[in-house]
């Protein structure tokens, strides 16, 4: 067990923090929640602090929750893959771009860390590019979200890891808006971190609302495992 | 865990100032004001961030109520100027462990016994 793997045993609160500004929107968010790495699960609420959302919230899902992959649930014989609980308390920087087919892109930098016992994202976001009328902009994606694999790979030259994926965003036409992901995340401590065989997280999403909540705001539920690495030729003997 | 106590409640006229306060017995994170007349439901009027930089309103009280909040004494505090007659019932005093400003009723973990507002 990595030494940051211990801080994930049990529930843990999280905390996360967005300013954006897309097309010169300028937005934040503040979502709370938390997470348990042994079930890889994550509960969270988000609100808009800043009025009406400007561009649709499953747009952000993963710059928020596939921000905090320390909680995926790694199986054991995959634990010294587990890149993101190792590089845990100090965290680690994430940065992506996301392309929006036919539309503008998102680029976003974040640190995932501990403060205290309580894991906290903090995200900038900068959108350009966007059609005002878009589906983006114009709103037109549907309010739920698709279950994806997320491939990871390590990046020895930065002691990091490096991340793609494509994520299928339903629009309210019945067609697919395509956002392609490309990631690295880099340690910010000095301390040692788990380099990774190549795998995937298989995610799993569900978005609601609750009733009782007057701002903009989005409710999420999420399943994240490890997956992709085979047990080794000892394992299948015993 | 900690004990909420509101007082400022009384019998106003409609159009007549009132000032509710609430003191905790020690830090908490976000707190807010819950407004519950005759027969309905507990609603939220206002809340404000432990760092005070977030607040927000229901769209009936904005322009009329203020809040604002004094951590070194853990009180919040409800400013109520041009009181109407749907303003009348029982205020609660409700607070949070973290420290998102929420406006739905089941993240608060915290609640006052409420203080009685009457409008005449």
């Known amino acids: 067990m990595s030494k940051g793997e211990e801080l994930f045993t049990g529930v843990v609160p999280i905390l996360v923090e967005l300013d954006g500004d897309v097309n010169g929107h300028k937005f934040s968010v503040s979502g709370e929640g938390e997470g348990d790495a042994t079930y890889g699960k994550l509960t969270l609420k988000f609100i808009c602090t800043t009025g009406k959302l400007p561009v649709p919230w499953p747009t952000l899902v993963t710059t928020f929750s596939y921000g905090v992959q320390c909680f995926s649930r790694y199986p054991d014989h995959m634990k010294q893959h587990d890149f993101f609980k190792s590089a845990m308390p100090e965290g680690y920087v994430q940065e992506r771009t996301i392309f929006f087919k036919d539309d503008g892109n998102y680029k976003t930098r974040a640190e995932v860390k501990f403060e205290g016992d309580t894991l906290v994202n903090r995200i900038e976001l900068k959108g350009i590019d966007f059609k005002e009328d878009g589906n983006i902009l114009g709103h037109k994606l549907e309010y739920n979200y698709n279950s994806h694999n997320v491939y990871i790979m390590a990046d020895k030259q930065k002691n990091g890891i490096k991340v793609n994926f494509k994520i299928r965003h339903n629009i309210e036409d019945g067609s697919v808006q395509l956002a392609d992901h490309y990631q690295q995340n880099t340690p910010i401590g000095d301390g040692p971190v788990l380099l990774p065989d190549n795998h995937y997280l298989s995610t799993q999403s569900a978005l609601s609302k609750d009733p009782n909540e007057k701002r903009d705001h989005m409710v999420l539920l999420e399943f994240v495992t490890a997956a992709g690495i085979t047990h080794g030729m000892d394992e299948l003997y015993k | 865990d900690v004990q909420l106590v509101e007082s400022g409640g009384g019998l106003v006229q409609a159009g007549d100032s009132l000032r509710l306060s609430c003191a905790a017995s020690g830090p908490t994170g976000a707190m807010a004001w819950f407004h519950q007349g005759l027969g309905k439901e507990r609603e939220f009027v206002g809340g404000i961030s432990p760092s005070g930089d977030n607040i927000y309103y229901a769209d009936s009280v904005k322009g009329r109520f203020t809040i604002d909040r004094d951590n070194a004494k853990n009180t919040v505090s409800l400013q109520m100027n041009s009181l109407k007659p749907e303003d009348m019932g029982v205020y609660y005093c409700?607070?949070?462990?973290?420290?998102?400003?929420?406006?739905?009723?089941?993240?608060?973990?915290?609640w006052g016994r409420g203080t009685q507002v009457t409008v005449s």
């Open positions: 409700a607070a949070r462990r973290r420290v998102t400003l929420f406006t739905s009723r089941t993240d608060y973990e915290f």
